[in-house]
């Protein structure tokens, strides 16, 4: 029950996170005009990853796309790439995790397969979240650098009475959406990975006695197969080295591949 809840919650949190990453990537307000030096401007500028916009006080908003690839700063291209990779990985992760959900039965899919898929989607969510956080952080760093550079050059060329105030940009709403969304996707991924441990088929303890067969040093289990799966370490024939009879409890259990996340 706890596993199902953890997995379900991880899926929902990741879903919200990825929706947020998509929203942040599409938003125009990655950077907004800093109004500290000119709070009475009648024109407000803001920029996104794909276009820049100008909102006039009169209510008119004009947006222009960046219709060039080569002319854009490498950092902006990098941020775009990180966000897109984050979205793609997240989308694939969501698709995989839908099939991995314990509450959804698809054919005769075994728990080990669901565990694998849960782990895979969890890792994808973690990487997706990290991509979004990295992308937003790179953009934020770029803004901070440019902000202080433009502050230093703010009144350059003030030969006479005329002032030319450079437009400075500060953090836009999309950055905060991106950070939160990336964090949620990351948390969702971690939850999926935790849920994966609980989904992994565990050793079932059978109190059946293993008998040493003459001529073979192999222990046979009577009816020792799991009802629903053909996998798991219990189905393996285990070698008994001392030739004596012992209960299955005493036989060393080999670690499952899902025991370590």
């Amino acid at each position: 029950m706890a596993v199902t809840a953890c997995q379900g919650l991880g899926f929902v949190v990741s879903l919200i996170g990825i929706a947020g990453i998509i929203a942040a990537t599409c938003m125009d307000q990655w950077s907004t005009q800093d109004l500290y030096n000119n709070p009475v401007t009648a024109v407000f500028n803001y920029q996104g990853l794909w276009r820049s916009c100008v909102r006039e006080s009169s209510g008119f908003t004009e947006c222009r796309g960046y219709f060039t690839l080569l002319g854009l700063p490498a950092m902006l291209q990098a941020v775009r790439a990180l966000m897109i990779v984050g979205i793609v990985l997240g989308a694939i992760g969501l698709l995989v995790s839908i099939f991995a959900l314990k509450c959804i039965r698809i054919g005769s899919m075994e728990d080990s397969a669901k565990a694998n898929m849960t782990l895979t989607s969890g890792i994808m969510f973690i990487v997706s979240g990290l991509c979004a956080i990295a992308g937003v952080s790179v953009f934020a760093n770029m803004l901070v650098t440019n902000f202080w550079m433009s502050t230093a050059n703010m009144y350059t060329g003030m030969g006479g009475m005329v002032q030319t105030v450079q437009t400075r940009y500060t953090f836009g709403a999309a950055l905060f959406v991106g950070w939160v969304a990336g964090g949620l996707t990351l948390i969702g991924g971690v939850m999926m990975c935790i849920a994966c441990r609980g989904l992994a088929p565990e050793e079932t303890n059978y109190k059946a006695v293993s008998y040493h067969a003459s001529g073979h040093s192999v222990a046979y289990k009577p009816g020792g197969f799991k009802a629903s799966t053909g996998f798991g370490s219990n189905t393996k024939n285990k070698k008994i080295y001392d030739g004596g009879a012992r209960t299955e409890d005493e036989v060393q259990s080999y670690p499952s591949k899902h025991d370590y996340v």
């Epitope: 005009q33 000119n38 009475v40 401007t41 009648a42 024109v43 500028n45 803001y46 920029q47 820049s52 916009c53 100008v54 006039e56 006080s57 009169s58 209510g59 008119f60 004009e62 222009r64 005329v162 002032q163 030319t164 105030v165 450079q166 437009t167």
Partner: antibody, heavy 117, light 113 residues
């Protein structure tokens, strides 16, 4: 078509409050801003203030303590209130709609307000 | 506040001749976001309200004859009437539409020589 019409008392006593109304038609009050501009007799234009579509206002720095601009969307009206008037406030008062580039693209005919005792 | 200075105060030009009015702002009116200058030109005839001629320094308002043109960037702007007509006699004002208060220039009175 867009129309603006100013109305109000033509004569106001010094130290009283000047109240004007601008009745508009042909555009949405929630989408566009309206500015108030005055012109003293024989002089140039002076921008007083503006109320935007979202209800926010901006006033001329010299009049900020005396000027209030508001709107009544249900009546399609904008109003200007200028307190503690003096003879220097005698002018033709215009209301005008803000358009592209924040430019004033439609103007009312104006109303002359004289401040005198 | 941005101070708008117009020159000359008055101008007399012969019919059919070119008329040029200048406007200078104390701060740049160029918006870096869209590379547009937030300067507007108005025409006011006696007894009438002002009429919008040009916004964004060079964009003609619809219905305005093409003999009117605006130019300039940053702090220096010009309104040009390529061939003066009798109906162009008026006072012309420039306005800062970039920063509040949206100040007007002092006006230039255009007459026929």
């Amino acid at each position: 078509q867009v129309q603006l019409q100013e109305s109000g008392p033509g004569l106001v006593k010094p130290s009283e409050t000047l109240s004007l109304t601008c009745t508009v038609s042909g555009f949405s009050l929630t989408s566009y801003g309206v500015s108030w501009v005055r012109q003293p007799p024989g002089k140039g234009l002076e921008w007083l203030g503006v109320i935007w579509g979202d209800g926010s206002t901006n006033y001329h720095s010299t009049l900020i303590s005396r000027l209030t601009i508001s709107k009544d969307t249900s009546k399609s009206q904008f109003s200007l209130k200028l307190s503690s008037v003096t003879a220097a406030d005698t002018a033709v008062y215009y209301c005008a709609k803000a358009g592209r580039g924040n430019a004033l693209d439609y103007w009312g005919q104006g109303t002359l307000v004289t401040v005198s005792s | 506040d941005i101070v708008m200075t117009q020159s000359p105060d008055s101008l007399a030009v012969s019919l059919g001749e070119r008329a040029t009015i200048n406007c200078k702002s104390s701060q740049s009116l160029l918006n870096s976001g869209n590379q547009k200058n937030y300067l507007t030109w108005y025409q006011q005839k006696p007894g009438q309200p002002p009429k919008l001629l040009i916004y964004w320094a060079s964009t003609r308002e619809s219905g305005v004859p093409d003999r009117f043109s605006g130019s300039g960037s940053g702090t220096d702007f010009t309104l040009t009437i390529s061939s003066l007509q009798a109906e162009d006699v008026a006072v012309y004002y420039c306005q800062n539409d970039y920063s509040f208060p949206l100040t007007f220039g002092g006006g230039t009175k255009l007459e026929i020589k």
